[in-house]
Interface confidence: medium
């Protein structure tokens, strides 16, 4: 999946299986990514688990779990708030669009989380105070999470190089750059560009991610995934000058 | 399988509160169509679920009983008559510690917010 970190770095990661997205003293977010096509290095998020840890007189521990085709508007115990404590309503789930869009507000840590299902896969976005982001007791283990450190270098895909190659060769794949040797050849570059332009008129990294995803999978739902990811940034990012990201270098983790 | 969600939305839309969709009005047919749409959306995860199959048959029965056409307007899910416990606005007596911004303002300016996102492939 494509990752935008807390420090506004943009990466495309091939991390497969379960990985920690956030792991601090207040909550833990873990994603499970699966290959989008057989033999593909590109992966997308098929499962998401969020654990809100027990916190003072505000909330009991609550677990939220979403999977492909299962985006509940409740925690796994069936509740929609933080439990029986005095401040239980400082944690609340709201269903925005049934089966497609859920928002979780954790007021006790000033945090808003948006989970969506777009096509077959899940998207995740969070707005969180720096103080909470950095509330990590054990930096050696907890500090390794993806939202903070980004993906390990060996798990990154250089999709800009792929983008350049695709531009030069139309629909043909260059084996060295292609993360999906088995991807369908049915999506010409021009069509992918047109589809992405429709939803993402600004040629930023979200637009480039969209083109990459269409060329890699042939699945137009990824256009919406990029579009909604940008919409979530607009809603959640505090710096309106940083909504669109353009230049991207192959970041080192950390 | 989300069939209970479909059921409860239909129950809420037709249960007598807020000028109900009574069973001889266009609103009732609209509520039925919304219900049918909801069951179709959850169909893939409900195979073999008896509650799901009962709902589907029940909808067909009611559609024909009340001469509802399959096409036509659908109703918006209506809010429940009574808010469930713990689903209302944050309790006024909730401790200040449970509201990050309020407690933050006590000893500092506005907190700095950051964003992280994950999407696509």
């Amino acid at each position: 999946p494509h990752l935008r970190t807390f420090t506004d770095r943009f990466q495309t990661c091939k991390v497969q299986g379960a990985w920690p997205l956030i792991d601090n003293n207040y909550l833990n977010v873990q994603v499970t990514n699966t290959p989008v096509l057989p033999g593909s290095a590109a992966t997308a998020t098929s499962k998401l688990t969020i654990i809100f840890k027990n916190f003072q007189e505000c909330v009991d521990q609550k677990v939220y779990q979403a999977e492909m085709d299962e985006l509940p508007a409740a925690f796994v115990d069936g509740s929609k708030n933080g439990g029986d404590k005095h401040g239980a309503n400082s944690l609340k789930i709201t269903e925005k669009v049934s089966g497609q869009h859920v928002e979780i507000q954790a007021k006790y840590i000033g945090t808003t989380i948006v989970v969506r299902q777009v096509g077959r896969y899940l998207t995740f976005a969070v707005r969180m105070p720096e103080e909470v982001v950095n509330a990590v007791e054990d930096w050696d283990s907890q500090g390794l999470y993806l939202c903070l450190r980004g993906c390990p270098l060996n798990q990154q895909i250089d999709f800009q190089a792929f983008h350049t190659n695709a531009e030069g060769t139309g629909a043909r794949r260059l084996a060295a750059a292609s993360p999906a040797p088995t991807a369908p050849e049915t999506f010409p570059y021009e069509t992918a560009v047109a589809k992405c332009k429709e939803k993402l008129p600004v040629e930023d990294l979200y637009y480039q991610a969209c083109v990459f995803d269409l060329l890699t999978t042939g699945d137009v739902n990824f256009t919406l995934a990029a579009y909604y990811a940008l919409e979530d940034v607009k809603m959640l990012h505090s710096n309106k000058d940083k909504l669109h990201l353009y230049e991207r270098t192959r970041d080192l983790p950390g | 399988c989300k069939i209970l969600k479909c059921n409860s939305e239909f129950w809420s839309a037709t249960s007598g509160s807020h000028a109900p969709a009574s069973d001889d009005t266009p609103e009732f047919c609209a509520a039925l169509r919304s219900y049918a749409l909801c069951t179709r959306r959850t169909a893939r995860t409900c195979r073999g679920d008896l509650a799901y199959h009962s709902a589907v048959h029940g909808i067909e029965d009611l559609m024909s009983q009340h001469n509802c056409s399959k096409d036509g307007p659908t109703s918006q899910p209506r809010l429940r008559t009574l808010p469930p416990a713990g689903d209302s606005q944050e309790r006024s007596d909730s401790p200040e510690i449970c509201h990050y911004e309020k407690s933050f303002h006590k000893h500092s300016a506005t907190p700095n917010y950051t964003h992280c996102g994950l999407f696509g492939d």
């Epitope: 508007a73 | 059921n7 509650a51 029940g58």
Partner: antibody, heavy 120, light 109 residues
């Protein structure tokens, strides 16, 4: 076989709270609502409210609003009904019942009942 | 909260028919597709007999039938049998008007 098994009888003092459990088996717990109904000695049935184990949504009888809390634990397929600030008129048999499938709201499977006695 | 009114008791000889009425308002009965009926023997949990006014769950004998006219729903037991002696309750799910009738004792003479 679809079954609802309730917790045992309780004796409580006025002002206390009681929490009755109802364990479901033989069906998909999250596909049906759970209603709670009570019956005072020699009296009729009194609907208390219902909960959706799928979403956590609840709808309580107006007269009990603020005193009753219905919850579910999907991991154990158990529904709970807690009634607080008990008074002598809350002495009753409390039943949980499965809300039937499909569009119609009815209670098709019932627990055996839990007698709650409120007495000083 | 409006009431659902049932007769306190009805009786009949074996083989006869008896009808129990349940009268409410337009919102609680007249417009509702949610009227159901329950049978309760002494010391036992209630048992669903009819739902959606007329529908019979599997296992319920076909001598139990239901109907609705205006704001009154009715349960009819034709060919009354000894085991039909019990209390019968109507029920309507109607948002804020969700409630049971007061109950009717059916006596088999």
């Amino acid at each position: 076989e679809v079954q609802l098994v309730q917790s045992g009888a309780e004796v409580k003092k006025p002002g206390a709270s009681v929490k009755v459990s109802c364990k479901a088996s033989g069906y998909t717990f999250t596909s049906h609502g759970i209603s709670w109904v009570r019956q005072a000695p020699g009296q009729g049935l009194d609907w208390m409210g219902w909960i959706s184990p799928y979403s956590g949504n609840t709808n309580y009888a107006q007269k009990l609003q603020g005193r009753v809390t219905m919850t579910t634990d999907t991991s154990t397929s158990t529904a709970y009904m807690e009634l607080s600030s008990l008074r002598s008129e809350d002495t009753a048999v409390y039943y949980c019942a499965r809300v039937g499938s499909g569009p119609y709201y009815y209670m098709d499977v019932w627990g055996q009942g839990t007698l709650v006695t409120v007495s000083s | 909260q409006s009431a659902l009114t049932q007769p306190r008791s009805v009786s009949g000889s074996p083989g006869q028919s008896v009808t129990i009425s349940c009268t409410g308002t337009s919102s609680s009965v007249g417009d509702s597709i949610y009227v159901s009926w329950y049978q309760q023997h002494p010391g036992k949990a209630p048992k669903l007999m009819l739902y959606d006014v007329t529908k019979r769950p599997s296992g319920v004998p076909d001598r139990f039938s239901g109907s609705k006219s205006g704001n009154t729903a009715s349960l009819t037991i034709s060919g009354l049998q000894a085991e039909d002696e019990a209390d019968y309750y109507c029920f309507s799910y109607a948002g804020t008007d969700t409630l049971f009738g007061g109950g009717t004792k059916v006596t088999v003479l």
